[in-house]
């Protein structure tokens, strides 16, 4: 039976007469698209999220839903509107036959339709001989309140709120949206139903084994007793949080999503909207030993995505699988054998493993940071999490070879104190998706809305690329990398920084065609060079060698190949000062690095010369890495010589402001 409502027939009759008065046609030239989960077993055909265009009002959403019902009824199909979305995304959730998709896609205001799909808890119960205590304990860094100014929302299973670890700390909301458990003989046992959520609530704010002991939590039930939920249920949960935030604005909000499903455009869009409303979202990278970008909400750029490591800082193996990895992961955190509240009794504890536990650690750290500095934006918080992480401690050999360069080698840690970070110029590296191998393929890397793109570089494993450039897109600079003929594809790498009151622009010099090579500098008064990029149209730049060292007294200048156009990123910001640091190796080498010294932050990373045997340049923390083709293929000719060029900046203004605060 498609519909349980007795008044269904009446509704259809009422709508049939209404339908013809709704003759708005979809706008010309825009076609709504249909999306579904790439993982077949996780698909839930028969339930669809119809997402409407951004400015659609609630009344229009309701009208569009009614129109769909009326048109479906005319064709003899039953439909049921399960939910009308507003507050986060305009749209509605409908139960209907897949035969109606074509019809639904033609409705006015429709942007896209997504078939519902499953999401899953990301923890593995683990048998232990010995239990390792959580590696980062809250007593290492405790603001007076331990996160008390922050509210953490947990979207998970039901929880045992009277457990001694979380009693009085977790408010169970009346929100519940879960699918039926699988299997006819499934026996609902309270302790099993509450297992996942209780443990995670304990990891975040548990009285004795929690990270942010002062944080208060609110739980929403979106996962059933088997740890399974739906994209639509999660969306409705996120909408509930947004509405709660609007009704009763409180202090900083952290939302913990310890779940994962297949890539979902709509779930990512909802996360983006909530993040832009000032909410910090933290999610599990997923336990599939796979690229996190293939899963949601892990793949949403606005969400802080957390992979799992063990006490030895190694990626966590979970049975035959393990932690996800890749460019969509922001950082890793302890996620193996984590002790937390067990729902078996109010004084029971259990060890669980997974990226859910890792995400709970980061949610706790975020709550503590926000409690100490409630005004932090999402971008500032993310940058601080990265800055205070333990660097280069993960054994990258565990990751597939093609993912090693893309995966951040960062393990979350609590800041040593609540002060002293304000003066720092924070930057992070953002990798694009792979461009694909076609001749004209490009890849784009973007910074978060309140970050500045200070430099742009590119990387190709085959070395066949045509460089990169910074360009304006929607009023913001983006970093675009270009593939070359015969290339297997490129990555664009953006260096994204927090630079308040910055005014940045890109200065370009076209190919010089002269023997001296191409040069460009920052000519505006008070503007300093933060990054250099070069882009060329020719397939192979050849062996022309420009002068590697720039002339004395020209620090504000980018130098490049005569056949390439050179782009300088020039910024003006209070107290900003930058310097160029180069490290050249005369003999060919697969990797050349140059690092900025203590107190300076790497903003730009590029290679000289830009010839085709250079695979590209990218920043890893405060080090500029230039990769070249295997030495054996280049030979030891002078062409093999490569220089890594780092641009290191600091902000005297931020330092002074910080000193004044203390």
């Amino acid at each position: 039976q498609e519909d349980e409502d007795g008044d269904y027939e009446e509704l259809v009759l009422a709508l049939r007469s209404e339908e013809d008065g709704l003759a708005e046609a979809p706008e010309h030239g825009t076609t709504a698209t249909f999306h579904r989960c790439a993982k077949d077993p996780w698909r839930l055909p028969g339930t669809y999220v119809v997402v409407l265009k951004e400015e659609t009002h609630l009344s229009q959403s309701e009208r569009t839903a009614r129109r769909l019902q009326a048109q479906a009824a005319r064709r003899g199909y039953l439909t049921k509107i399960l939910h009308v979305f507003h507050g986060l995304l305009p749209g509605f959730l409908v139960k209907m036959s897949g035969d109606l998709l074509e019809l639904a896609l033609k409705l006015p205001h429709v942007d896209y339709i997504e078939e519902d799909s499953s999401v899953f808890a990301q923890s593995i119960p683990w048998n232990l001989e010995r239990i390792t205590p959580p590696r980062y304990r809250a007593d290492e860094y405790q603001p007076p309140d331990g996160g008390s100014l922050v509210e953490v929302y947990l979207l998970d299973t039901s929880i045992q709120s009277d457990h001694r670890e979380i009693e009085g700390r977790v408010m169970v909301t009346d929100f519940e949206n879960v699918p039926e458990e699988d299997g006819t003989r499934f026996h609902r046992q309270a302790s099993k139903c509450d297992s996942h959520g209780t443990h995670l609530a304990g990891v975040v704010s548990g009285r004795d084994a929690g990270v942010a002991k002062g944080a208060s939590m609110r739980s929403l039930r979106v996962l059933n007793c088997q740890g399974k939920g739906t994209v639509s249920g999660t969306l409705i949960g996120l909408e509930f949080i947004r509405k709660s935030q609007l009704v009763q604005p409180v202090g900083p909000l952290v939302v913990l999503l310890p779940l994962a499903g297949g890539y979902s455009r709509v779930l990512n869009a909802a996360c983006q909207r909530l993040a832009r409303a000032g909410v910090v979202l933290v999610t599990a990278a997923g336990n599939f030993r796979d690229d996190a970008c293939l899963y949601s909400p892990a793949s949403a750029p606005e969400v802080i995505t957390v992979g799992a490591t063990n006490a030895q800082d190694q990626p966590v193996t979970l049975g035959t699988l393990g932690t996800n990895f890749g460019r969509c992961v922001d950082l890793f955190a302890p996620g193996e054998d984590i002790i937390g509240a067990s729902s078996d009794c109010s004084t029971c504890f259990v060890s669980q493993s997974g990226t859910s536990q890792a995400a709970a650690h980061v949610a706790g750290i975020a709550a503590m940071m926000l409690s100490a500095e409630p005004e932090l934006t999402l971008a500032e918080l993310r940058q601080r999490l990265i800055h205070f992480s333990a660097k280069d401690v993960i054994n990258e050999a565990w990751f597939p070879e093609d993912q090693r360069v893309l995966t951040p080698n960062l393990v979350a840690a609590l800041p040593p104190s609540t002060h002293g970070a304000g003066w720092q110029l924070f930057c992070r590296t953002v990798w694009s998706a792979h461009s694909g191998p076609t001749r004209m393929a490009t890849a784009v890397a973007r910074c978060a809305p309140d970050e500045e793109l200070l430099s742009c570089s590119s990387f190709s494993r085959s070395g066949k690329r045509r460089g990169e450039r910074m360009e304006a897109q929607g009023g913001k600079l983006v970093c675009r990398a270009h593939n070359a003929f015969g290339g297997e594809g490129v990555y664009a790498i953006a260096r994204c920084c927090l630079l308040p009151q910055a005014n940045c622009s890109v200065h370009t010099a076209p190919p010089a065609e002269a023997s001296m090579g191409t040069r460009v500098h920052c000519h505006q008064q008070g503007h300093v060079l933060t990054g250099c990029s070069s882009h060329w149209e020719v397939e192979d730049l050849g062996t022309h060698k420009p002068p590697v060292l720039r002339p004395r007294g020209q620090p504000n200048q980018c130098v490049g190949h005569r056949e390439a156009s050179i782009h300088a990123s020039c910024c003006h910001a209070p107290g900003l000062e930058c310097k160029v640091k180069e490290h050249g190796i005369p003999a060919p080498q697969e990797q050349v690095t140059v690092a900025c010294e203590e107190g300076w932050t790497l903003t730009g990373c590029s290679a000289l010369p830009g010839t085709s045997h250079v695979l590209g340049a990218y920043a890893v923390d405060n080090t500029c890495v230039v990769r070249s083709r295997d030495v054996s293929t280049t030979g030891s000719t002078s062409e093999g010589a490569v220089t890594a060029v780092a641009i290191c900046c600091r902000s005297r203004h931020l330092a002074q402001a910080s000193q004044e605060l203390q």
Partner: antibody, heavy 131, light 106 residues
Framework: QVQLVQSGAEVKKPGSSVKVSCKAS????????ISWVRQAPGQGLEWMGG????????NYAQKFQGRVTITADESTSTAYMELSSLRSEDTAVYYC????????????????????????WGQGTLVTVSS | DIQMTQSPSSLSASVGDRVTITCRAS??????LNWYQQKPGKAPKLLIY???TLQSGVPSRFSGSGSGTDFTLTISSLQPEDFAVYYC????????FGQGTKVEIK
């Protein structure tokens, strides 16, 4: 049978700290979960907190949170209780007592049940707080 | 925290009497209750655990019953060495003790 031997009586000034020790003999110390219970003169018993060696965490009663620290040294089979910011009402006999950490196998997990059943007690340490 | 209320707070009895002490929990604690005996200047001694299980070495004249919120300790025939203070203690959550019942010689 586990024997618990506590350190001697202490006289402390208000605002200072006291650290009482409890040495276990008989049985494996690693399996000894130790709680601390105090009794003010003429009053009843009050649980302060416990150390759970297998779990690697200490649990504290809400009332004492932030003021009490319970630790254990496996090498000497000794548990410690430190109480800071002492006031006159902290004058009491402080007992260490062994409780249990019971392992329950459920759903492929090892669940640890903190069973606060005190079968073995130390002789008690009188702490007097007076100016 | 779970509150434990003992009654009576004191009682006078003679050797050979049957004595009953009750303990009430502020919320259901299943059978997570222990009974202790304490003599002046000494540490408490465990008599009954899990509501009704006699600790080894404890005479069989001691028995415990109840579950949920209401519990009882019974001494079937009071002996001279039984004059002491008795405490109930729950362990369903953080351990809390009753205020004690003093058993005195009539």
């Amino acid at each position: 049978q586990v024997q618990l031997v506590q350190s001697g009586a202490e006289v402390k000034k208000p605002g200072s700290s006291v650290k009482v020790s409890c040495k276990a003999s008989g049985g494996t110390f690693n399996s000894h979960a130790i709680s601390w219970v105090r009794q003010a003169p003429g009053q009843g018993l009050e649980w302060m907190g416990g150390i759970n060696p297998i779990l690697g965490i200490a649990n504290y009663a809400q009332k004492f949170q932030g003021r009490v620290t319970i630790t254990a040294d496996e090498s000497t089979s000794t548990a410690y209780m430190e109480l800071s910011s002492l006031r006159s009402e902290d004058t009491a006999v402080y007992y260490c007592a062994r409780h249990y950490e019971i392992q329950i196998g459920r759903y492929g997990m090892n669940v640890y049940y903190l069973m606060y059943r005190f079968a073995s007690w130390g002789q008690g340490t009188l702490v007097t707080v007076s100016s | 925290d779970i509150q434990m209320t003992q009654s009576p707070s004191s009682l006078s009895a003679s050797v050979g009497d049957r004595v009953t002490i009750t303990c009430r929990a502020s919320q259901g604690i299943r059978s997570a209750l222990n009974w202790y005996q304490q003599k002046p200047g000494k540490a408490p001694k465990l008599l009954i655990y899990n509501g009704s299980t006699l600790q080894s070495g404890v005479p069989s004249r001691f028995s415990g019953s109840g579950s949920g919120t209401d519990f009882t300790l019974t001494i079937s025939s009071l002996q001279p060495e039984d004059f002491a203070v008795y405490y109930c203690q729950q362990f369903d959550g953080d351990p809390t003790f009753g205020q004690g019942t003093k058993v005195e010689i009539k």
